[in-house]
């Protein structure tokens, strides 16, 4: 957020940057929450994004029986391990079709008995106020995949017709980790000081992070002809004076017409 | 990345024989899964014979006691002896491999595959 400077006075606007802003020759530049001339107004709102997508990720372990372990496939980089991947990568591909959040599959490791398979499922979703509950049916939903699919495809006289056959009782989900995202929490970090002022209200399922002097939301303070400004002990009306009228109050709302305290004093003089 | 080159195939007669070789190329030869594949016009491709370097075979029930599959790792080939040939072993054979010791039937776990050679039964 800048404000520039012209004339001669912005040599002393050089040195009164407030905030942490820095001088550039022209104008302060101000840091994410602040803005004005010398950087001294905090902002009304901040941009905390969300995020287009929230991701998760499902440790999983699956043994398939229609490929014989060899040492080779410890090894990335082998031939042997490449066109493991690339059979397993298109057999997951086709089991979890029908998830629209599932991403794809990452093996971490392959190991003995007959092959181990430890890996893990991606999954990702837009971002919604629901994301948690979305990701979580998607979770059920790879869980009963892998579970049909390997109790379906399974060696018979020890052939398999499948891309792929699976021990039965090797399934395992290890863990599932989805990634964390708390508007509330980035509001109050992204609000520093002024962190117990700042509030996420949402709008068209879009979080805002936003503090009383921002207009337009249930908890915007209303200084009707006054200004709002945060300070460090929340935020405050500060009443305008017209022509007419001094204003006072909490917000503003406490209208002294001049000429009848002129008159007051005039009086008592 | 592995090179396979078919030959062999031909028109003969029921009862006849004919035997189909693989070319290989690359150093992968002596290890993994090697296998006959064929495919009849309008039909899915199906697997004929399989072998594997820790020497497990496979035949199809229809091909059994009449075809046999070898390998000549020296040569980096691997063949495909037919007897008793019959009109329904007519197709285009297919040679496929994969460096996985494999124990499956299906066509989409394996890797490599030749350009396949015709095979034609009749009299």
């Known amino acids: 957020r800048t404000t520039t400077c012209f004339g001669d006075g912005c040599q002393n606007t050089a040195s009164r940057c407030k905030n942490g802003g820095t001088w550039d020759g022209l104008k302060c530049q101000c840091p994410n929450l602040y803005y004005g001339e010398l950087c001294e107004e905090v902002v009304s709102s901040i941009d905390i994004g969300p995020p287009e997508t929230i991701s998760a990720q499902m440790e999983l372990t699956v043994t398939v029986t229609s490929v014989k372990f060899t040492e080779e496939l410890k090894n990335h980089s082998s031939q042997e391990f490449q066109e493991f991947k690339q059979t397993f990568t298109e057999q997951m591909n086709i089991v979890y079709s029908g998830i629209p959040e599932y991403v794809g599959v990452n093996i971490t490791k392959l190991r003995l008995g007959s092959v181990v398979v430890e890996h893990d499922v991606l999954l990702r979703t837009k971002y919604t106020p629901e994301y948690k509950t979305v990701l979580d049916n998607a979770t059920e939903v790879v869980k009963e995949k892998i579970t049909k699919v390997t109790t379906q495809q399974i060696m018979i006289n020890d052939i398999c017709s499948d891309m792929m056959c699976f021990n039965t009782t090797g399934t395992q989900v290890q863990n599932i980790t989805v990634t964390q995202y708390d508007p509330e929490e980035d509001c109050r970090k992204m609000a520093k000081e002024y962190g117990d002022y700042f509030v996420v209200e949402y709008r068209d399922q879009k979080p805002y992070c936003i503090s009383p002097c921002e207009p337009g939301f249930s908890v915007s303070k209303n200084c009707n002809l006054g200004k709002c400004q945060m300070s460090l002990s929340g935020p405050q009306c500060l009443c305008v004076t017209t022509e007419t009228h001094w204003y006072s109050g909490e917000t503003c709302n406490q209208g002294t017409q001049k000429s009848l305290v002129y008159g007051h004093h005039h009086h008592h003089h | 990345e592995v090179q396979l080159v078919e030959s062999g195939g031909g028109v003969v007669q029921p009862g006849g024989s004919l035997r189909l070789s693989c070319a290989a190329s690359g150093d992968t030869f002596s290890r993994g899964s090697w296998g006959w594949f064929r495919q009849a016009p309008g039909k899915e491709r199906e697997a004929v014979a399989l072998?594997?370097?820790?020497?497990?075979?496979f035949y199809a029930d229809s091909v059994k006691g009449r075809f046999t599959i070898s390998q000549d790792n020296s040569k980096n080939t691997l063949y495909l002896q037919m007897n008793s040939l019959r009109a329904e072993d007519t197709a285009m054979y297919y040679c496929?491999?994969?460096?996985?010791?494999?124990?499956?039937?299906?066509?989409?776990?394996?890797?490599?595959w030749g350009q396949g050679t015709q095979v034609t039964v009749s009299s």
């Open positions: 496929a491999a994969s460096v996985l010791v494999l124990r499956t039937l299906n066509p989409k776990a394996w890797h490599h």
């Open positions: 072998i594997s370097s820790d020497g497990w075979t």
